[in-house]
Interface confidence: medium
């Protein structure tokens, strides 16, 4: 979690002198409670916005907006603490609005916004706005919280943000998977414009079950520049295991901008429909011709049980 770096953070508006400060998320009013505290925020709204840094990078940000209740407690409102908690890591970042002048009622409801918390694709956050000072231990709460889910990089606007582009969001491999026979799958996909290797993970499952019965990993070496944006095809050899008929193919690129953390794309082949009168199948079909003197195991992850081509 971080703040967008692009300009001095502003919270002043007509009728209010205000400054934005870093916060430890532990306001002084927790330690030294006050007798009179303001009421809670009203109508807290969190939206996904996009903002550019000074360097021109585009980032998703949480746009936080709330209004004040129209009661006399605004006379005791000294500011607000904005807290963003990333739910999967428990990481928290806070800022504090510090009011340098007293608030007065005016003909419009007071409204505040803040759009400088940078958020990550496909993450969920809890956004809390605390009015300051915070209430005494048994006092009524004066905060409002909302959860906020950031879309992943498949989302049209997210796709062109810097974090998504860095993880390979602009690459559309357009995967097709075709069952050639009971023992072979053909995978076709479009290469990206970078000399980097790819990894294909084949995971097979029994019909209607979620524990895998077979895994095979295949390495595709970095294509040459003339092969960029071309289709590549790989033939994967399947293990002839009972009922292991649903196949998921996942392609992992290793682009320089994201290394091991690039977006992965996958496609699935369902189990074939069972015919009314099953055809007899041969008891055993060899998976490969053993190479003379070869002692390589060819099961879950051997390179030897697949081959690939790039073609224009």
């Amino acid at each position: 979690l971080r703040l967008l770096d692009h300009r001095a953070l502003v919270c002043s508006q007509p009728g209010l002198n205000c400054t934005v400060k870093n916060s430890t998320c532990l306001d002084d009013s927790w330690i030294h409670p006050r007798n009179l505290t303001p009421s809670s925020p009203k109508d807290l709204q969190i939206q996904l916005h996009f903002a550019h840094t000074q360097q021109g990078d585009l980032f998703p940000v949480a746009h936080i907006e709330w209004t004040l209740q129209t009661d006399a407690s605004i006379l005791y409102l000294e500011g607000a603490e904005l807290s963003v908690l990333q739910l999967n890591t428990n990481e928290r970042l806070c800022v504090r609005f510090e009011f340098l002048s007293k608030l007065r009622h005016h003909h419009r409801r007071w409204r505040f916004t803040f759009s400088h918390f940078v958020v990550d694709p496909d993450q969920e956050y809890e956004v809390t706005v605390h009015h300051l000072p915070k209430p005494i231990p048994d006092g009524d709460p004066n905060h409002q919280s909302k959860n906020f889910l950031v879309p992943d990089c498949e989302h049209a606007r997210m796709k062109v943000t810097t974090p998504c582009m860095s993880s390979g969001s602009l690459w559309d491999p357009n995967i097709t998977v075709e069952t050639l026979d009971t023992q072979h799958l053909r995978v076709d996909f479009t290469l990206w414009n970078e000399s980097t290797h790819y990894q294909i993970l084949l995971t097979s499952f029994p019909h209607m079950e979620n524990h895998s019965c077979f895994e095979h990993m295949h390495h595709i070496p970095a294509p040459r520049p003339e092969e960029f944006h071309q289709r590549s095809n790989v033939t994967l050899t399947l293990r002839n295991l009972k009922g292991c008929c649903r196949h998921q193919v996942q392609i992992q690129p290793f682009f320089s901008s994201c290394l091991n953390d690039c977006l992965r794309h996958s496609a699935t082949v369902s189990c074939p429909e069972m015919p009314d009168t099953p055809e007899p199948i041969p008891d055993y079909m060899p998976l490969w011709e053993p190479r003379s003197g070869s002692s390589d195991y060819k099961d879950d992850d051997d390179k030897g049980s697949s081959h690939h081509h790039h073609h224009h």
Partner: antibody
Framework: QVQLVQSGAEVKKPGASVKVSCKAS????????ISWVRQAPGQGLEWMGW????????NYAQKLQGRVTMTTDTSTSTAYMELRSLRSDDTAVYYC?????????WGQGTLVTVSS | EIVMTQSPATLSVSPGERVTLSCRAS??????LAWFQQKPGQAPRPLIY???TRAAGIPARFSGSGSGTDFTLTISSLQSEDFAVYYC?????????FGGGTKVEIK
Amino acid sequence: QVQLVQSGAEVKKPGASVKVSCKASGYTFTRYGISWVRQAPGQGLEWMGWISAYSGNTNYAQKLQGRVTMTTDTSTSTAYMELRSLRSDDTAVYYCARRQLYFDYWGQGTLVTVSS
Amino acid sequence: EIVMTQSPATLSVSPGERVTLSCRASQSVSSNLAWFQQKPGQAPRPLIYDASTRAAGIPARFSGSGSGTDFTLTISSLQSEDFAVYYCQQYDNWPLTFGGGTKVEIK
């Protein structure tokens, strides 16, 4: 060369848990799954389950489902097998082995004794 | 689950003899079968996979055959270091299962 080095012997009381580690070296850890096999004293081999070091997918023996958890730490190339609610008939040598279907390299084994 | 049955349970033989160990599956396992050798206090050692392919570093005196339900491990001329317990294992279907083992002892 490929090596799987397991943690040392353990003595546990019934109802307790044990966590056995298996540190792999000499190959790319995420390219191969790790299977776990146990052998009670004087008995044969029993397959316990498997974990993919790449995807984290697991497949456990039905009789151990709910009591066993297999995990990996790719940063240290280590696989772990935790068995909970131990009983006296869990006393065995526990082996980790490389691969999913058949096993080309084995750890040296970890003796787990369950006794009150 | 597929039950693997090995016979005999114990075999007493002299060095130099030809040894044939049998493994039977309760249903077809195609050729998805492996053989292991285990000596006291040691981890199993892979000998054969895919019913007939020797694992790395395994001497030519060990050979495997069979498919479907009946499999054989043959040691053409038994050496002193071959006295051990031998296990078969199927990997055609989950759960993976082992045979009960055949102990090859000195006559």
